[in-house]
Interface confidence: low
Amino acid sequence: DTEIKVNPPQDFEIVDPGYLGYLYLQWQPPLSLDHFKECTVEYELKYRNIGSETWKTIITKNLHYKDGFDLNKGIEAKIHTLLPWQCTNGSEVQSSWAETTYWISPQGIPETKVQDMDCVYYNWQYLLCSWKPGIGVLLDTNYNLFYWYEGLDHALQCVDYIKADGQNIGCRFPYLEASDYKDFYICVNGSSENKPIRSSYFTFQLQNIVKPLPPVYLTFTRESSCEIKLKWSIPLGPIPARCFDYEIEIREDDTTLVTATVENETYTLKTTNETRQLCFVVRSKVNIYCSDDGIWSEWSDKQCWEGEDLSKKTLLR
């Protein structure tokens, strides 16, 4: 029996299309595939950012694959050919690995890159990113922000910078159509007449950095002699009710503080007949059904009732 062998793919390379971290991995079929014309050859691709402990593994019949990477670090990838067992009348045959790497040659020292980058997607509508200039950079240094997500033809530059002392320290983004639930890539680079400035790359998903508006229309309703229902409404905007978690702070007679986290726009509170004053505030956050993370809203305006015996009144704002 002659041992069946297969060559690795040819021309394996990582191509940067200018999408700030979304790279193309591509290759050509191996040499000498004539013996396996009836066979569908597959490829096992492994790739990672340099420094990462784990490889991502993909099996594909295609000659290309695309994914996002952290361009602050280098990228390494390897690929080999797989002949399925149906082609070899036995076990799967694998070629040796073809390997490649990619990295962006860094300019400037790390301290020159932007510091404390912070992005917030306000009410799932308006994206704002802010940063601080690098350490020790001169006032002639200016930073520029570029962004890309799947759906844009090419990376776009910020057109509405937030400035301080003539320097760009943030960006107000335009309306970003169909931009959530996919990776959003940002590069902040810089220029200075005195020294090169290090670029910084960031990747996140917009639904994970949402800061909602606070809840509105807080009300009280007497349910029974010892229960009061607190109610509020979701804030105006595109976020559906099913996406909210709420945190409530309730104060009775300036002494008792109750905090609770709930999924609905109501909370039933046990009270005593002696309660003279009741105040509460609510804040909202996007929940785990709609995002992996989020930012608490500001607290709502405080809603209080005082002066009359709570047991004798239905309380509405």
Epitope: T60, N62, I288
Partner: nanobody
Framework: EVQLVESGGGLVQPGGSLRLSCEAS????????IGWFRQAPGKEREGVSC????????VYTDSVKGRFRLSRGTAKNTVYLQMSALKPEDTAVYYC?????????????????????WGQGTLVTVSS
């Protein structure tokens, strides 16, 4: 409205094979991902595998790598999960799900949060 229908579940002996099908209808986009999930009795639902309509790439959870294989039917709206060398611990209700908002599969560990349409599930029992 997107509808997903799974089929192909059943009783199989350890070491045996099954092919599950997921047929999707009611969607307009060509760009989407379809994932297979499973939920064993008394356990949380876990991601098994994912395929992208755009790139035909597949991603698998570690426990099924080399045993399960995802593929697309000639009609683009059908996805097959070929399961071989089945083990008793593969016993679960298997669900397929679609996310029409994504074009690439996420990490398996976070996959359950990314899907907006779900099927009703099909039961796979591996037992001798």
């Amino acid at each position: 409205e997107v509808q997903l229908v799974e089929s192909g579940g059943g009783l199989v002996q350890p070491g045996g094979s099954l092919r599950l099908s997921c047929e999707a209808s009611g969607f307009a986009s060509d760009d989407y991902i379809i994932g297979w999930f499973r939920q064993a009795p008394g356990k949380e639902r876990e991601g098994v595998s994912c395929i992208s309509s755009k790139y035909a790439n597949t991603v698998y959870t570690d426990s099924v790598k080399g045993r399960f294989r995802l593929s697309r039917g000639t009609a683009k709206n059908t996805v097959y999960l070929q399961m071989s060398a089945l083990k008793p611990e593969d016993t679960a209700v298997y669900y397929c799900a679609m996310d029409s908002r994504r074009v690439t599969c996420p990490e398996i560990s976070t996959m359950h949060r990314n899907f907006d349409s779900w099927g009703q599930g099909t039961l796979v029992t591996v037992s001798s």
